[in-house]
Amino acid sequence: AILGRSETQECLFFNANWEKDRTNQTGVEPCYGDKDKRRHCFATWKNISGSIEIVKQGCWLDDINCYDRTDCVEKKDSPEVYFCCCEGNMCNEKFSYFPEMEVTQPTSNPVTPKPP
């Protein structure tokens, strides 16, 4: 491991579509990938009239957008499906939304996921 970097070996797994996809609904996912490439965790969710609905959580392949992010934070302004990625075991257990506004100050919308 490189000093100062959180290696990701496992992530929280969740799949809202688990029956159709024939997977578990929730659990811990071991992350696989090429030995020299970095691994990350991700979370995706929707905001339906202020109610948070988790879509999927799991492992994410080597992605410079996720480098050195210990927290899972979506920064895009009002996406259809929210996505964040991070480094470190189970770093996707919690996720949040901090839109990067150009003019106004960003507002914080921290989310603690509660799978149904």
Partner: antibody
Amino acid sequence: QVQLVQSGAEVKKPGSSVKVSCKASGYTFTSSYINWVRQAPGQGLEWMGTINAVSGSTSYAQKFQGRVTITADTSTSTAYMELSSLRSEDTAVYYCARGGWFDYWGQGTLVTVSS
Amino acid sequence: QSALTQPRSVSGSPGQSVTISCTGTSSDVGSRNYVNWYQQHPGKAPKLMIYGVSKRESGVPDRFSGSKSGNTASLTISGLQAEDEADYYCGTFAGGDYYGVFGGGTKLTVL
């Protein structure tokens, strides 16, 4: 092992659309991006766009904006690239590739646009 | 985003070393370690050789190495072999906040 298998060659008329598929296997489809790249005969590689396979979020090269649509069907682990308003200059081999580093590539799909 | 600039062709004899350059700007090649190198033989799909400027893809011989200085990334192939004759492309990471771009390609001839 990771494999990306693309649909077969297509011959299209100018003005029509083409939809190329890319079926992924050997890894979790929703764990990365799928990128699309094309290569005209005797020319170099040209990036067209990308899709986040789990969120469906897309980004397109400015040149193709408004003419290309990339989608992903997670139930079949398949990505699609649709190019509309075809012209002769769109004759090319179209490739899909996995992830931001393009570490695995499909075999390519030749699209010929001819009247 | 503008295409990256590569020489049209380079050549070398078996056993020699060759270097292929890829020049961008301070906002792409210069600012981040996200340049990749691909090898493409005629009629085949490209193959990732080097990613993140200098990381060798799994299974790629250590004769292939990548580096960067300023706004220029370089691919060096040492101990040239006949099978190294191919087209080589540099390109950038694409996904999320990053848009992809490729160089025009360099034809490597092994004399």
